[in-house]
């Protein structure tokens, strides 16, 4: 009973233009193009979008007009392939244009770059931004969509429309405020941080679909929606999962118009059926479309129904377990996952999926045994160590976080992960470890019942960043193994890695540890990144360095930066004191 079965349309482009409206249509086409051709200048994209929009309007006027019956992939692909500098700018991606659909679109998708060689976005002065906003609001907002989309080629397009709406609201309000900066900058910081988080979460969904298949994504969705909507019947959850899978498959596949349209339909369905889904949806459903969809996606878990019976009755004690499993394996496992998840909002989704996998493996083995019931009778006992492992890990790491604070906790993780996978590039190790370290301030403040879903599901998102960055330039078999063997066991796989004894320490290069006065003008965050980069390089030079040795060197380094930034002749200080620091550090580490 999917909500997405529609009558066939003569013209798909006209259908989507009418459903979405011109503004959203143009925004989504811009996002799609920027996510595919990440290096193209803004003006080129705007030109392409305008051409597509004009064409769409002719199809709205007459669905039988020439080319209006073509698929969106054909229309968009043809348009992208008109870019004159395709070969020079994108190299082998230009070969995609020699292919036919659907291979051409698959080719474009494979060339999406998670780490494009683009300059860091520098925020101009507030007055400059406000002037640009007032001079041409439409261009200003399009530029925002373009810049985010090209840097985040898997950003969830309908959600990016929501971010753009908030971006516009921030400028509309703050550019009129007495203190523009005080009003605007915190809002922009919040949007930036939320945007990065949103991008990373969506990247995991796309990786799940693309690398592990629809079944893996559906399992994730069953678990998460069952936690969120524990009062909903299994049939209702299954229907939502089917529809949500379609939406994300479309967005991850570059079908952004269909994705946004179907997401709107899904929000509409959910709000029309609140009574059978969740008591927490009322406020969300009173909001406009973009806010409504975002709100539903973030809605808190509903209360669990009272008197839920024991799970064991149907899934362990019942004599019909193997019969039910054999009749419809995925449905039976789906019901198990639904029942387990709705009872355990305190578990991470990945833990629930590990339990379901353990249950499946046990049934596969036991239902072929002489006495199946005897064989699977103790299956729930096998869950205990699987539950305790993340619980203990989170407890230990939250204690460490509370003891060290975020920066030093990040440093501990930097050392830990550099020793595990020293072949990974330093910028990737710094980025990933910093994000791993943020789990402390994000999740350790929560009570026990909320810690695991917060922490472990967040770690899954961050480790996926490592996996997608590493996939672009693979350097470590251990990373490849943890990333590809099992989606739900990625975190335990990385946790279990010990120091890589096969690693040959990096040659010492004094240039890596040479610092200049420009460090003094950096923000606190950027200064931390500089220091953390040095820390990773130290570990790569001396993987067997002890915590104490590394701490001593880092303390000396912090003192050196502080001293030279206070000096009258900063550059001379950095040059002279820097040499001494390098020598002292080499001696301390026995380099």
């Amino acid at each position: 009973r999917g909500v997405f079965r529609r009558d066939a349309h003569k013209s798909e482009v006209a259908h989507r233009f009418k459903d979405l409206g011109e503004e959203n249509f143009k925004a989504l086409v811009l996002i799609a193009f920027a996510q595919y051709l990440q290096q193209c200048p803004f003006e080129d994209h705007v030109k392409l979008v305008n051409e597509v929009t004009e064409f769409a309007k002719t199809c709205v006027a007459d669905e039988s007009a020439e080319n209006c019956d073509k698929s969106l992939h054909t229309l968009f692909g043809d348009k992208l392939c008109t870019v004159a500098t395709l070969r020079e700018t994108y190299g082998e991606m230009a070969d995609c244009c020699a292919k036919q659909e659907p291979e051409r679109n698959e080719c474009f998708l494979q060339h999406k770059d998670d780490n494009p060689n683009l300059p860091r976005l520098v925020r101009p002065e507030v007055d400059v931004m406000c002037t640009a906003f007032h001079d041409n609001e439409e261009t200003f907002l399009k530029k925002y969509l373009y810049e985010i989309a090209r840097r985040h080629p898997y950003f969830y397009a309908p959600e990016l429309l929501f971010f753009a709406k908030r971006y516009k609201a921030a400028f509309t309000e703050c550019c009129q405020a007495a203190d523009k900066a005080a009003c605007l900058l915190p809002k922009l910081d919040e949007l930036r941080d939320e945007g990065k988080a949103s991008s990373a979460k969506q990247r995991l969904k796309c990786a799940s679909l693309q690398k592990f298949g629809e079944r893996a994504f559906k399992a994730w969705a069953v678990a998460r929606l069952s936690q969120r909507f524990p009062k909903a019947e299994f049939a209702e959850v299954s229907k939502l999962v089917t529809d949500l899978t379609k939406v994300h498959t479309e967005c991850c596949h570059g079908d952004l118009l269909e994705c946004a349209d179907d997401r709107a339909d899904l929000a509409k369905y959910i709000c029309e059926n609140q009574d059978s889904i969740s008591s927490k949806l009322k406020e969300c459903c009173e909001k406009p479309l973009l806010e409504k969809s975002h709100c539903i996606a973030e809605v808190e878990n509903d209360e669990m129904p009272a008197d839920l019976p024991s799970l064991a009755a149907d899934f362990v004690e019942s004599k019909d377990v193997c019969k039910n499993y054999a009749e419809a394996k995925d449905v039976f496992l789906g019901m198990f996952l639904y029942e387990y998840a709705r009872r355990h909002p305190d578990y991470s989704v990945v833990l629930l999926l590990r339990l379901a996998k353990t249950y499946e493996t046990t049934l596969e083995k036991c239902c072929a045994a002489a006495d199946p019931h005897e064989c699977y009778a103790k299956v729930f006992d096998e869950f205990k160590p699987l539950v305790e492992e993340p619980q203990n890990l989170i407890k230990q790491n939250c204690e460490l976080f509370e003891q060290l604070g975020e920066y030093k906790f990040q440093n501990a993780l930097l050392v830990r992960y550099t020793k595990k996978v020293p072949q990974v590039s330093t910028p990737t190790l710094v980025e990933v470890s910093r994000n791993l370290g943020k789990v402390g301030s994000k999740c350790c403040k929560h009570p026990e019942a909320k810690r695991m879903p917060c922490a472990e599901d967040y770690l899954s998102v961050v480790l996926n960043q490592l996996c997608v960055l590493h996939e672009k330039t693979p350097v470590s078999d251990r990373v490849t193994k943890c990333c590809t063997e099992s989606l739900v066991n990625r975190r335990p796989c990385f946790s279990a890695l010990e120091v890589d004894e096969t690693y040959v320490p990096k040659e010492f290069n004094a240039e890596t540890f040479t610092f200049h006065a420009d460090i003094c003008t950096l923000s606190e965050k950027e200064r931390q990144i500089k220091k953390q980069t040095a820390l990773v390089e130290l570990v790569k030079h001396k993987p067997k360095a002890t915590k104490e040795q590394l701490k001593a060197v880092m303390d000396d380094f912090a003192a050196f930066v502080e001293k030279c930034c206070k000096a009258d002749d900063k550059e001379t200080c950095f040059a002279e004191e820097g040499k001494k620091l390098v020598a002292a550090s080499q001696a301390a580490l026995g380099l």
Partner: antibody, heavy 121, light 110 residues
């Protein structure tokens, strides 16, 4: 007081449909498997099927396709939907609580008083 | 799956020891998933014995059950006036769809 009360019986024409209800009080309907059993006038007991605590349904081979067991936990009520009724479906229909939760053990330890269904033209 | 009770009817006197047998066409689940019921006219059945030999709550100890696999027995050690009724066996099998009742044994006063 712990009890089961059936309702919804009556006279129906052959080919017609009927939905029987069984209201539980004093306990949660979803805490055990719940079944339906019928008894034709002057005859023995005949098992129809059960619904487990998790909502799995099991039917006697003769009942599959025509009869559907469901439950509404919020109303604490069990249902038996009967379609394509025949003269031979004339009987007293009992709902009953099984000792087990996830399957039918055949041991029903709490019974309703029954509701009479007559199928005739 | 067939559940055959014998005899189909039986006459006895107060104080008598009475035995009713039940045979299934295949083994019941776990070799012991068999129950016995008592039913009086105009009333629903009442569970007496479950799992072949366990006495249900509130049932007098003069009732007992035995047997395993396919052959089972209900024994009333000393018949009381209130025991005159119809008795049914019911078996649970490897699938919950196969639960079945015996045809019944009508116990009357001699």
């Amino acid at each position: 007081e712990v009890q089961l009360v059936e309702s919804g019986g009556g006279r129906v024409q052959p080919g017609g449909s009927l939905r029987l209800s069984c209201a539980a009080s004093g306990f949660s309907l979803s805490s055990n498997a719940m079944g339906w059993v019928r008894q034709a006038p002057g005859k023995g007991l005949e098992y129809i099927g059960i619904i487990s605590v998790g909502g799995f349904t099991y039917y006697a081979s003769w009942a599959k396709g025509r009869f559907t067991i469901s439950r509404d936990n919020s109303k604490n009520t069990l249902y038996l939907q009967m379609n394509s009724l025949r003269a031979e479906d004339t009987a007293t229909y009992f709902c009953a609580r099984d000792r087990h939760g996830g399957d039918s053990s055949g041991a029903f330890y709490l019974w309703g008083q029954g509701t009479q269904v007559t199928v005739s033209s | 799956i067939q559940m055959t009770q014998s005899p189909s009817s039986l006459s006895a006197s107060v104080g008598d020891r009475v035995t009713i047998t039940c045979r299934s066409s295949e083994s019941v689940y776990s070799n012991n998933q068999l129950s016995w019921y008592q039913q009086k006219p105009g009333q629903p059945p009442k569970l007496l014995i479950y799992d072949a030999s366990d006495l249900a709550s509130g049932v007098p100890s003069r009732f007992s059950g035995s047997g395993s696999g396919t052959d089972f027995t209900l024994t009333i050690s000393s018949l009381q006036p209130e025991d005159f009724a119809t008795y049914y066996c019911a078996g649970g099998f490897s699938s919950s769809s196969d639960t079945a009742f015996g045809g019944g044994t009508k116990l009357t006063v001699l």
